[in-house]
């Protein structure tokens, strides 16, 4: 409740997160008439990426382009990229939509289509749909520990969300355990009224709000966080206009002394932790 006599100041905060969980992934890669089923285990180092600020990312899906090498090859025949003669291809041209620099030659991409040859990481990335269901859909059961230290410098008061009495095996629940700072990812989505399985396919951005409403007067002292959750990305975005949340990264290796890479388009959930509130004292 707003106490008009109190001197209030905004919270200063730092956040640290730790994600835990193991996913077993079975992926189908079909090329050249062979569907290869691969079974792999993903641990924290495989699916989380360090982000700056109060954010963490959990990969829930991916598309791989394996065995790429820097050379010349036909570019992917996306809409408007096909050619019938060299006239259509400009040497040295870098189309922002393309994956390389054109050589000026129009070459066969497959039996029926020709595209401009490019100097690039080859074969160039295909425009593939994100797998459905998501490959790491079991990330729903991962947990995240959120450590939040706060400070009110004007009142010379510091505290944190984790109390010495807290049980390390607890899981946050709005009713049964609202002070537990270990959150199951699926529960975060449920609380926000979202379907994890669906969002996991293309990715998205989820907000974890930590609200501190602190009364620092000794006679009625109260300073504990309240957690709430809401989706931050626009889930109603037209499917054709960059839905979800994804980025690309590469794993580099050498094969027969040739540098190669596996390009990974990672889809996932970026969790933004938003800490706000005030501390009031007479």
């Amino acid at each position: 409740s707003d106490k008009l006599y109190q001197r209030k100041e905004p919270v200063i905060s730092s956040v640290h997160t730790k994600v835990k969980g193991i996913a077993e992934v079975t992926e189908n890669v079909t090329e050249g008439g062979v569907t290869k089923l691969g079974h792999s285990i993903f641990d924290t180092a495989d699916y989380t990426f360090p982000l700056q600020g109060n954010s963490f990312f959990v990969m829930t899906n991916y598309v791989k382009s394996e065995g790429q090498v820097q050379t010349l090859c036909p570019e992917y025949p996306r809409r408007g990229a096909q050619c019938s003669s060299d006239r259509r291809c400009k040497k040295g041209w870098m189309d922002p939509q393309s994956k390389g620099i054109q050589t000026g030659r129009c070459v066969p991409y497959d039996k029926t289509r020709k595209t401009c040859e490019v100097s690039a990481w080859c074969p160039t990335e295909e425009e593939k749909e994100a797998p459905r269901p998501a490959l790491l859909r079991s990330a729903e059961n991962f947990t995240v520990l959120i450590k939040n230290n706060i400070h009110f410098p004007g009142h010379n008061y510091t505290t944190r969300n984790i109390l010495p009495t807290m049980n390390g095996s607890c899981t946050f629940h709005k009713t049964w355990d609202p002070q537990c700072s270990i959150f199951r990812l699926g529960d975060i989505f449920q609380e926000a009224g979202e379907n994890f399985t669906e969002v996991a396919v293309q990715g998205g951005i989820m907000g974890i709000e930590i609200y501190w409403d602190c009364n620092l007067d000794s006679w009625s002292h109260h300073c504990r966080p309240r957690y709430s959750f809401r989706r931050l990305d626009d889930k109603n975005t037209d499917e054709s206009f960059v839905p979800g949340y994804n980025f690309r990264y590469a794993k580099y290796y050498k094969e027969n002394n040739v540098e190669k890479r596996t390009l990974i388009k990672a889809f996932g959930i970026r969790f933004d932790i938003l800490v706000f509130g005030t501390g009031g004292k007479f």
Epitope: E31, G32, G33, V34, T35, K36, L37, H39, K111
Partner: nanobody
Framework: EVQLVESGGGLVQTGGSLRLSCAAS????????IAWFRQAPGKEREGVSI???????FYADSVKDRFSITADGAKTTVFLQMNSLKPEDTAIYYC??????????????????????WGQGAQVTVSS
């Protein structure tokens, strides 16, 4: 019309080698993957090796490092070089064109994409 004709089968001693050939007509190896399957008396048919239409090779765990699948330059004939043969390699070997599944060292036909095209088979007998 798609046709596959195997040759090169025969009788060989344990530890010996054989080279099977599969002559393909009515299609090119750019259209399908080619695999070798085998069936021993009283046993289920098992996939041995695949050559994908983009040139990747796959082997069943039972033949890895002993068998090798290749194609000729014209991509009309596929070969299965079999070394260090064992009595348990005795079977009828079939050449198959189609779509396949490779799962942790096991090879099977991708029946969702059809039953493939099969040759008549070549007998391989390994005596001890």
């Amino acid at each position: 019309e798609v046709q596959l004709v195997e040759s090169g089968g025969g009788l060989v001693q344990t530890g010996g080698s054989l080279r099977l050939s599969c002559a393909a007509s009515g299609f090119t190896l750019d259209d399908y993957a080619i695999a070798w399957f085998r069936q021993a008396p009283g046993k289920e048919r098992e996939g041995v090796s695949i050559l994908s239409s983009i040139g990747k090779t796959f082997y069943a765990d039972s033949v890895k490092d002993r068998f090798s699948i290749t194609a000729d330059g014209a991509k009309t004939t596929v070969f299965l070089q079999m070394n260090s043969l064992k009595p348990e390699d005795t079977a009828i070997y079939y050449c198959v064109a189609g779509h396949f599944v490779y799962n942790d060292g096991a090879i099977s036909l991708n029946t969702a994409r059809g039953s493939g095209f099969w040759g008549q088979g070549a007998q391989v007998t390994v005596s001890s």
